[in-house]
């Protein structure tokens, strides 16, 4: 056979479908790889051919379009399963060709099983709702094209094992599920089951998504630097380790990039010669507000280092803030003679740098270590 432009296995499209449910799968060539659509290709005399490789096999084989009740069929650039079976799992290839042109792409299709509470290995899309924000809706996803607009399906919504009925603040409204006022208790997995008739048969489409209740933009504030602050002075003797935490609270903001960084004498730590290490950790509240802590560490601080300006900066979509740490060199306590009287030991405690306890909130923690010379 003549040469064919082979786009390989498109693993970006990890298609997962439920067992015993209809599935319509569009050939990815027209969506991601070619600059023309199926209609144009068809008008130009190109033919779309489908074949597949079963799971754990190497042999490419044609798809059987002569199964009872047309279980697998092709319509334009769509491969239809009515319904899927577990052993339909495999790599599917669509090839567009005529005598002079050929282009093909393969993609994995996984048929997955679900239990009675809709648990499955299916990767779930996440829908974020703002906490206490007024009415917000989620819509049963990926059901377009399965039945004509003349067909009126029945839609049942579930949270886990339970049908959504009589809930305090969640109301099923056909394809939509309305949250009158979203609360933390509304976090979880929601499933819509769409039931529709076709040629005397009844089909079900199951779609599950994760709802995550997040901080409301009404309550969002610019970054808040909790540390360094005016109450803590970092007093060190040369040769000691200097540790300064920068702890910043960020309100949740959709698609906002939160940044924290230190400057030393106005320069990024990368751009100066002193041996400084920055350790970062991130924690999230239940509503995805974020606390970032960057600990600046100088193992053996010098007199020069103790004269520098250490400033913590933070930025989000809500604004930028900065705060300087109070750093000074510890003044050695005067030596008293015996006659000079005791009772001064406490002075050392007053001048001692306050110790800061660093508490990471609950949630997910990510640690990053940067070493700068």
């Amino acid at each position: 056979s003549e040469r064919c432009d082979d786009w390989g296995l498109d693993t970006m499209r990890q298609i997962q479908v439920f067992e015993d449910e209809p599935a319509r799968i569009k050939c990815p060539l027209f969506e991601h790889f070619l600059k023309f659509n199926y209609s144009t290709a068809h008008s130009a005399g190109l033919t779309l051919i489908w074949y597949w490789t079963r799971q754990d096999r190497d042999l490419e084989e044609p798809i059987n379009f002569r199964l009872p009740e047309n279980r697998i069929s092709k319509e334009k650039d769509v491969l239809w399963f009515r319904p899927t079976l577990l052993n339909d799992t495999g790599n599917y290839t669509c090839m567009l060709r005529n005598t002079t042109y050929c282009s093909k792409v393969a993609f994995p299709l996984e048929v997955v099983q679900k239990d009675s509470c809709f648990n499955s290995p299916m990767k779930l899309p996440v829908h974020k709702l703002y906490i206490e924000y007024g009415i917000q809706r989620i819509t049963c996803p990926n059901v377009d094209g399965y039945f004509p607009s003349s067909v009126k399906p029945t839609i049942t919504w579930y949270m886990g094992c339970y049908k959504i009925q009589n809930f305090n603040n969640v109301i099923p409204e056909g394809m939509n599920l309305s949250f009158l006022i979203a609360l933390i208790s509304n976090n979880g997995n929601y499933t819509c089951v769409v039931t529709y008739p076709e040629n005397g048969r009844t089909f079900h489409l199951t779609r599950t998504l994760t709802v995550k209740v997040v901080g409301s933009p009404k309550n969002a504030v610019p970054p808040v630097i909790h540390s360094p602050n005016d109450h803590v002075v970092y007093e060190k003797e040369p040769g000691e380790e200097l540790l300064i935490p920068c702890t910043v609270y960020f309100s949740f903001l959709m698609d906002s990039r939160n940044e924290v960084w230190w400057t030393i004498d106005g320069k990024k730590p990368d751009d100066i010669t002193i041996d400084v290490t920055i350790n970062e950790s991130i924690s999230h509240s239940r509503t995805e507000d974020e606390t970032r802590t960057q600990i600046l560490s100088i193992k053996k601080v010098t007199s020069e280092d103790l004269k520098r300006s250490y400033v913590c900066h933070a930025r989000s979509a809500k604004g930028e803030v900065a705060k300087a740490a109070k750093v000074k060199q510890k003044v050695p306590a005067p030596r008293y003679t015996v006659e000079g009287g005791g009772g001064t030991g406490g002075l050392n405690d007053i001048f001692e740098a306050q110790k800061i306890e660093w508490h990471e909130g609950g949630g997910h923690h990510h640690h990053h270590h940067h070493h700068h010379h």
Epitope: D115, N166, G188
Partner: antibody, heavy 122, light 107 residues
Amino acid sequence: QVQLVQSGAEVKKPGSSVKVSCKASGSPAEPYAIQWVRQAPGQGLEWMGYIIPSLGGYDYAQKFQGRVTITADESTSTAYMELSSLRSEDTAVYYCARGQTLYDSGRQFDIWGQGTLVTVSS
Amino acid sequence: EIVMTQSPATLSVSPGERATLSCRASQSVSSNLAWYQQKPGQAPRLLIYGASTRATGIPARFSGSGSGTEFTLTISSLQSEDFAVYYCQQYNNWPWTFGQGTKVEIK
């Protein structure tokens, strides 16, 4: 360790109502459902209904519709099952049961209360 | 609603012997079936869910099998503490329904 503690035995007259309580201790942060199941003397188990305390959702078995009301007080982690228009055949041990989450298929009756005997007699 | 039928109603077995209990559903419940054990004066205890998965703390002598409409609970070697009533329950369709129970008694 999650535990369910039910209210004590009750003797009721036909036509009256009974309200059985079920207090959960060591409750997880995630929503869960409380199920109610009854067992007449020497008989099998019969599911009556459920409530999801933190979300308010509930449902009842067809047989008990109109006679049973299941409620919950989240502040005290207590669920209640009220059965009205009692008759002698309602004499049974009433159990509450629950799972850890709303998602555990097959484990929605993971933890059981000790049961409450309700005797209906004139 | 789905009707669950258990057999036999009573099973007489000697300690150390194998006991096999059956449960039939009036329509397919896939693998959405649980087994419970109940001793006199006690609440039921979950033994098996998903037709074959043992619940936490349940000894290995208890095993479940089957799918669709036919299910079996097997106790490989009966101990004195296993003499009790056993119930199956389907949770494939609402309302969730129980079988009428099988009493396992000492022979």
